[in-house]
């Protein structure tokens, strides 16, 4: 069964910077990845980045850089914008659309007692969606 993993990491050098890493574990080719702030019901809320293998990347502040790490994983660097962007308490969701499996989504957040430079363990809690 395909799975999506999510890691949220605070940068050791810049305490106001965070990186979200997401990956897809399963067969098939990735046609689209959407990263969003978590919303109600544990699913993605508002988009922060959309990555397409051929059409490129759209991203929205506070996202700084979205990129492919491998053919099945991506990273999104975020810039904390102060008190109104409580990344430490925020959920991030990654949704992978793959052919022929369909869409798989998982969410993760920074652990409450994260040391800078340490990442959250993978959290493959797939939300099955027949999109």
């Amino acid at each position: 069964t395909p799975e999506v993993w999510v890691q949220v990491q605070m940068e050791a050098t810049e305490l106001s910077s965070f990186t979200v890493h997401c990956g897809f574990l399963g067969p098939g080719s990735i046609s689209l990845v959407t990263v969003s702030w978590g919303g109600p019901d544990g699913a993605g809320g508002t988009k922060l980045a959309v990555l397409h293998p051929e059409l490129g990347t759209r991203q929205w502040a506070p996202a700084r850089q979205a990129r492919w790490e491998t053919q099945s994983s991506i990273s999104l660097a975020l810039e904390d914008s102060g008190a109104s962007s409580p990344f430490a308490n925020t959920t991030f969701c990654c949704k992978f659309a793959s052919f022929p499996e369909g869409s798989w989504e998982s969410c993760g957040s920074l652990p409450p007692s994260s040391d800078p430079g340490l990442s959250a363990p993978p959290t493959p809690v797939p939300i099955l969606r027949a999109d």
Partner: antibody
């Protein structure tokens, strides 16, 4: 009926701060982002930033990052923008507008605007 | 940042005429473009999103077209209520930027 009701005109002194509000009604507040846009007299529109009401997360135009702070009070369905260290260059009409979370449909409802006049 | 260039800056036309406003993006924004109308002393109103989809309640005399870097807004058979300013805006990603505007005046 969807409405974004903004606070009234603000005459302020140079160097001061001002906080303007945008009260949403007629829809579920956390289902839409709230954006803020500036229009100086007789000029075009400039995007300042947005806030996601569900978690209070904000994204800013780098140009306004040291000028504006966006917050929300979900219990009253109200978004706020605080502007600091005001100069005459900041005299403008400031609008709030909503955008659905998928970000594919533009800003479909706008507030009536709040006029900020910076003068000694 | 993506720059949006609108032309013409101003335009005079009469009721019943057809006018076209153009907008150029400094890089490919696919179809992520919106058009807004603003009347004097009022807030902007969404007319078109995704380059060619009319917003709810917008009369069919308005039409948007284009993709990539070149876009246009066409108004057929101008009505008295159509005079005002028009702005394009990309929604490809932030920072969102607007065109300089086109002021449509009565001839």
């Amino acid at each position: 009926e969807v409405q974004l009701q903004q606070s009234g005109p603000e005459p302020v002194k140079p160097g001061a701060s001002v906080k303007i509000s945008c009260k949403a009604s007629g829809y579920t507040f956390t289902d839409y982002n709230i954006h803020w846009v500036r229009q100086s007299h007789g000029k075009s529109l400039e995007w300042i930033g947005y806030i996601y009401p569900y978690n209070g997360g904000a994204g800013y135009n780098q140009k306004f990052k040291s000028k504006a702070t966006l917050t929300v009070d979900s219990s009253s369905s109200t978004a706020y923008m605080e502007l600091r260290s005001l100069t005459s260059e900041d005299s403008a009409v400031y609008y709030c507008a909503r955008e659905e979370l998928r970000r594919d449909y533009g800003m479909d409802y706008w507030g009536q605007g709040t006029s900020v006049t910076v003068s000694s | 940042d993506i720059q949006m260039t609108q032309s013409p800056a101003s335009l005079s036309a009469s009721v019943g005429e057809t006018v076209t406003i153009t907008c150029r993006a400094s890089e490919n924004i696919y179809s992520y473009l919106a058009w807004y109308q603003q009347k004097q002393g009022k807030s902007p109103q969404l007319l078109v999103y995704n380059a060619k989809t009319l917003a709810e309640g917008v009369p069919s005399r308005f039409s948007g077209s284009g993709s990539g870097t070149q876009f246009s807004l066409k108004i057929n058979s101008l009505q008295p209520e159509d005079f005002g300013s028009y702005y394009c805006q990309h929604h490809y990603g932030t920072p969102y930027t607007f065109g300089g505007g086109t002021k449509l005046e009565t001839k």
